[in-house]
């Protein structure tokens, strides 16, 4: 190798000066007594290099780029070497931002998975590699107070969201949960999450059934519908609310929404619908009064009102 | 401090009738699920029934339906189960227990003998 | 109906031994495993919640791992007062069910 560069620094914030230095060893002055040493950014030359020979008899040029204003590229120094350049070595130059401070972070706990899914988002682009880590600790008070480190949760590549398994999480017991992000720039940390992951808790919803017509229930009055629901055997022990949303199959009406249900109503008398039209149906829950986050709506369930009873006049018969 | 005392078990004939109470304190009663568990004189632990916060939701085990019915009063705190056709088999210590969000049981009474015999 | 399975039903150890019960769902049951004690002539006690969480004023030494249908409980080191006999139990549907136990002896 007949040439080196080095840099000040080859990661900057986007827009900054770079000042770089290529030096030419003496054993390699046969090519030109006096060689002269050019720059090229990407496929750009470069002009403003200083030149000096040192005391060795080493050749030095020294650049500085006032802005360097390419997310990446490739810095090379360079002889002439007849009609074409010979690099003599290159170095890679990033730019870019540090990590702004995730914002937004949320978290739910999902019973099915047993695990507390937390996501967030990451700010701005950075073009640079930039690396996120959920990080948490328990608690036993408001998160003052710092208890047992948990196991960082790293997600995987260019996500923003990641799961705590169940055997690093203690229900009933506050958490502190933040969001750490990295980069050859800085560091920043979201605020932190104080929270009990049953506080989070999505449940998953009930599943809605039509109510089998017994021979002593009187039939649904006509803009009525009857249906029942079956709850997540799972979340059973957990209080809840709920509440149903219908539209007409038909036509581009939005959905109406009733409630709130008690979870343990399990049947239902929907009235004041359109009769002889059908409707799609759904329901969500939430633990409540404790807090949780709604289920999402429930597979939808589809019912038609019955035709509206025909209307009886009556003569007299005069004898 | 949250506390259940059980009341109500005795020598009672087969096919005769029983009613257990159990009485809460320490906790709001009407926010929680509640059950009976038994335990047969030398043996494990067999779920009964449980009931839902308001009373609604009242599953019971294949061998005490239709014989067993469990009711609560969450203006009394007090739990009940009233056991009807009793057999020498439901013979047990029944115990009454709060019911946590997840299904297990915490904490339990002190628990009432059943005896059932002739 | 989930069917649930406990061993050993007995188990004979000596005060400072690791201690380790199983238990297995007939059936996926997630995490709705709890893990009592009992002592002759007393109420059961709720050690574990939850397949893995510890109840409040429960010591350290026990523990509780798995999900699906393999479960354990572990004693650390066998205290005095460990000697009982222990039940698993699932809540993930009705009905309910408990396993038969393990009775822990002194050796």
């Known amino acids: 190798e007949c040439g080196h560069i080095s840099v000040s620094a080859p990661i900057v914030h986007l827009g900054d000066p770079i000042t770089a230095s290529c030096i030419i060893k003496q054993n390699c002055s046969h090519l030109d007594p006096e060689p002269q040493i050019l720059w090229r950014l990407g496929a750009e030359l470069q002009p403003g290099g200083r030149q000096q020979r040192l005391s060795d008899g080493t050749q030095e040029s020294i650049i500085t780029l006032p802005h360097l204003n390419h997310t990446q590229a490739f810095l090379s120094c360079a002889l002439n070497w007849g009609n074409s350049l010979q690099i003599l070595d290159q170095v890679e130059l990033r730019a870019g931002y540090p990590p702004a401070i995730p914002h937004n972070l949320s978290c739910l706990m999902n019973l099915t998975t047993s695990s507390l899914i937390c996501q967030w988002e990451p700010g701005p682009e950075t073009h640079l590699p930039t690396s996120f880590t959920l990080k948490s600790f328990k608690s036993r008070g408001n998160c003052q107070t710092q208890g047992d480190s948990i196991l960082d949760c790293v997600p995987k590549d260019g996500q923003s969201h990641c799961s705590i398994p169940r055997k690093h999480l203690l229900l009933y017991q506050n958490m502190g949960i933040w969001v750490q992000a990295e980069n050859a720039l800085g560091t920043s940390m979201s605020p932190q999450l104080c929270l009990d992951p049953m506080d989070v808790v999505k449940l998953e919803p009930p599943m809605l059934r039509t109510m089998d017509p017994s021979p002593e229930a009187a039939p649904p009055q006509a803009g009525c519908l009857q249906l029942s629901w079956e709850p997540w055997q799972p979340g059973l022990h957990i209080n809840q609310k709920c509440e149903l949303r219908h539209k007409p199959q038909r036509g581009e009406a939005s959905w109406a929404l009733v409630g709130p249900l008690p979870l343990e109503a399990l049947q239902y008398e929907l009235c004041g619908l359109l009769p002889a039209t059908a409707y799609t149906l759904q329901i969500r829950c939430i633990r409540w009064p404790l807090p949780g986050h709604w289920s999402d709506w429930s597979p939808s369930l589809e019912l038609r009102t019955t035709e509206r009873a025909p209307t009886h006049h009556h003569h007299h018969h005069h004898h | 401090e949250v506390q259940l005392l059980e009341s109500g078990g005795g020598l009672v004939q087969p096919g005769g009738s029983l009613r257990l109470s159990c009485a809460a304190s320490?906790?709001?009663?009407?926010?929680?699920?509640m059950g009976w568990v038994r335990q047969a004189p030398g043996k494990g632990l067999e779920w009964v029934s449980s009931?839902?916060?308001?009373?609604?939701?009242?599953p019971y085990a294949d061998s005490v339906k239709g014989r067993f019915t469990i009711s609560r009063d969450n203006s009394k705190n007090t739990l009940y189960l009233q056991m009807n056709s009793l057999r020498a088999e439901d013979t047990a210590v029944y115990y009454c227990?709060?019911?946590?969000?997840?299904?297990?049981?915490?904490?339990w009474g002190q628990g009432t003998l059943v005896t059932v015999s002739s | 109906d989930i069917q649930m399975t406990q061993s050993p039903s007995s188990l004979s150890a000596s005060v400072g031994d690791r201690v380790t019960i199983t238990c297995r769902a007939s059936q996926g049951i997630s995490s709705y495993l709890n893990w009592y004690q009992q002592k002759p002539g007393k109420a059961p006690k709720l050690l574990i919640y939850y397949a893995s969480n510890l109840q409040n004023g429960v010591p350290s030494r026990f523990s509780g791992s798995g999900s699906g249908t393999d479960f354990t409980l572990t004693i650390s080191s066998l205290q005095p007062e460990d000697f009982a006999t222990y039940y698993c139990q699932q809540s993930y549907m009705y009905p309910i069910k408990f396993g038969g136990g393990t009775k822990v002896e002194i050796k």
């Open positions: 009931i839902s916060s308001s009373g609604g939701v009242t």
């Open positions: 227990a709060k019911l946590g969000e997840l299904g297990w049981f915490d904490p």
């Open positions: 320490g906790f709001t009663f009407s926010l929680y699920w």
